[in-house]
Amino acid sequence: LPAQVAFTPYAPEPGSTCRLREYYDQTAQMCCSKCSPGQHAKVFCTKTSDTVCDTCRPGWYCALSKQEGCRLCAPLRKCRPGFGVARPGTETSDVVCKPCAPGTFSNTTSSTDICRPHQICNVVAIPGNASMDAVCTSTSPTRSMAPGAVHLPQPVSTRSQHTQPTPEPSTAPSTSFLLPMGPSPPAEGSTGD
């Protein structure tokens, strides 16, 4: 008779390991399904029920990933005015921001916008800087503007410019987390920033 296929969760045979895309849950003492990269374990497995996976919400990424899935979803960084996206965020990595180089600008607070070139003017009314496009005196620039470049001056942020910008001030996703002592941290002596 062929061996039966074991469906998760199941107790592994003594001396054996869990299969590919499974992990051994110490609490349940069972082989359970891993969540796919970028997903988090919404509900961890028990002796009778398998892992329930969920993705981090749009605009968030997995900051703390583990073999059983994501432990902590976090909002993607937003690059402030004067800074653009150097490396986009992925399911498991945050956005990396960089200062806009001379001749480029970003006037948005965004987790997707890159630095764009200043428009080229016949006569410059206001020179561009890292957080503002150039303003021309003539009605149109000599060369076609970069796609999406702005004609009118934008308000310059008065806040200090950080290369580590603002996450969304929205409510966190409900992530289940295995704590050492139930709902509260241990007496002596957590995860996140």
């Epitope: 968030w60 997995c62 704590l179 941290p185 996140g192």
Partner: antibody, heavy 121, light 111 residues
Framework: EVQLLESGGGLVQPGGSLRLSCAAS????????MSWVRQAPGKGLEWVST???????YYGASVRGRFTISRDNSKNTLYLQMNSLRAEDTAVYYC???????????????WGQGTLVTVSS | QSVLTQPPSASGTPGQRVTISCSGT????????VNWYQQLPGTAPKLLIY???QRPSGVPDRFSGSKSGTSASLAISGLRSEDEADYYC???????????FGGGTKLTVLG
């Protein structure tokens, strides 16, 4: 017993470098974000940096670009590489574990005893 | 200057109730949960209250936290001499993408 033990502090000249280590024990190290918090002599607490997995890290404005946080999960150790040190970096540096039930609910729940870094010529 | 504002000192006699305030903004206290830390003289800080009003196991119920809008408070009832310490509030700040602390309040137990 859950424990964090910092090392690597000492006297360094301005412009110099130093690497702090924090050895963790008594818990599953890679389940947690880890942080560095410092306290200048006679002053209050100042957050320095936090790391989650990989290079998912955050830095305080006063150290960004000079300090680098990293972790070695196989060694249960957290590091802080401090470059271009200044007199104002003189402080006791604490390693702290970050408890998280969600992004909005986080706290430093375990602290080490601290290691003193003195930047002086 | 600290992002979160605390009174530099507070005092009370044994058995009294003392409250320490912590004032912030919409990007820190209002948007995120507040934690309180106790630092006894010559020791490392210890988590006292997390998630606005939760006590870790081992922290006496004489300590309680509350939050309203952009302000938070730590209350200590039945004050004891061993409560003499520095107390710090802290919260994540969305605008700074970092943790911010209050300047600390030195609590003195009189008598």
């Amino acid at each position: 017993e859950v424990q964090l033990l910092e090392s690597g502090g000492g006297l360094v000249q301005p412009g110099g470098s130093l690497r702090l280590s924090c050895a963790a024990s008594g818990f599953t190290f890679d389940d947690y974000g880890m942080s560095w918090v410092r306290q200048a002599p006679g002053k209050g607490l100042e957050w320095v940096s936090t790391i989650y997995s990989g290079d998912n890290a955050y830095y305080g404005a006063s150290v960004r670009g000079r300090f680098t946080i990293s972790r070695d999960n196989s060694k249960n150790t957290l590091y802080l590489q401090m470059n271009s040190l200044r007199a104002e970096d003189t402080a006791v540096y604490y390693c702290a574990r970050v408890y998280s039930s969600s992004w909005r609910k986080r706290a430093f729940d375990i602290w080490g005893q601290g290691t003193l870094v003195t930047v002086s010529s | 200057q600290s992002v979160l504002t605390q009174p530099p000192s507070a005092s009370g006699t044994p058995g009294q109730r003392v409250t320490i305030s912590c004032s912030g903004t919409s990007s820190n206290i209002e948007s995120n949960t507040v934690n309180w830390y106790q630092q006894l003289p010559g020791t490392a800080p210890k988590l006292l209250i997390y998630s606005d009003n939760q006590r870790p196991s081992g922290v006496p119920d004489r300590f309680s936290g509350s939050k309203s809008g952009t302000s938070a408070s730590l209350a200590i009832s039945g004050l004891r001499s061993e409560d003499e310490a520095d107390y710090y509030c802290a919260a994540w700040d969305d605008s700074l993408s970092g943790w911010v602390f209050g300047g600390g309040t030195k609590l003195t137990v009189l008598g």
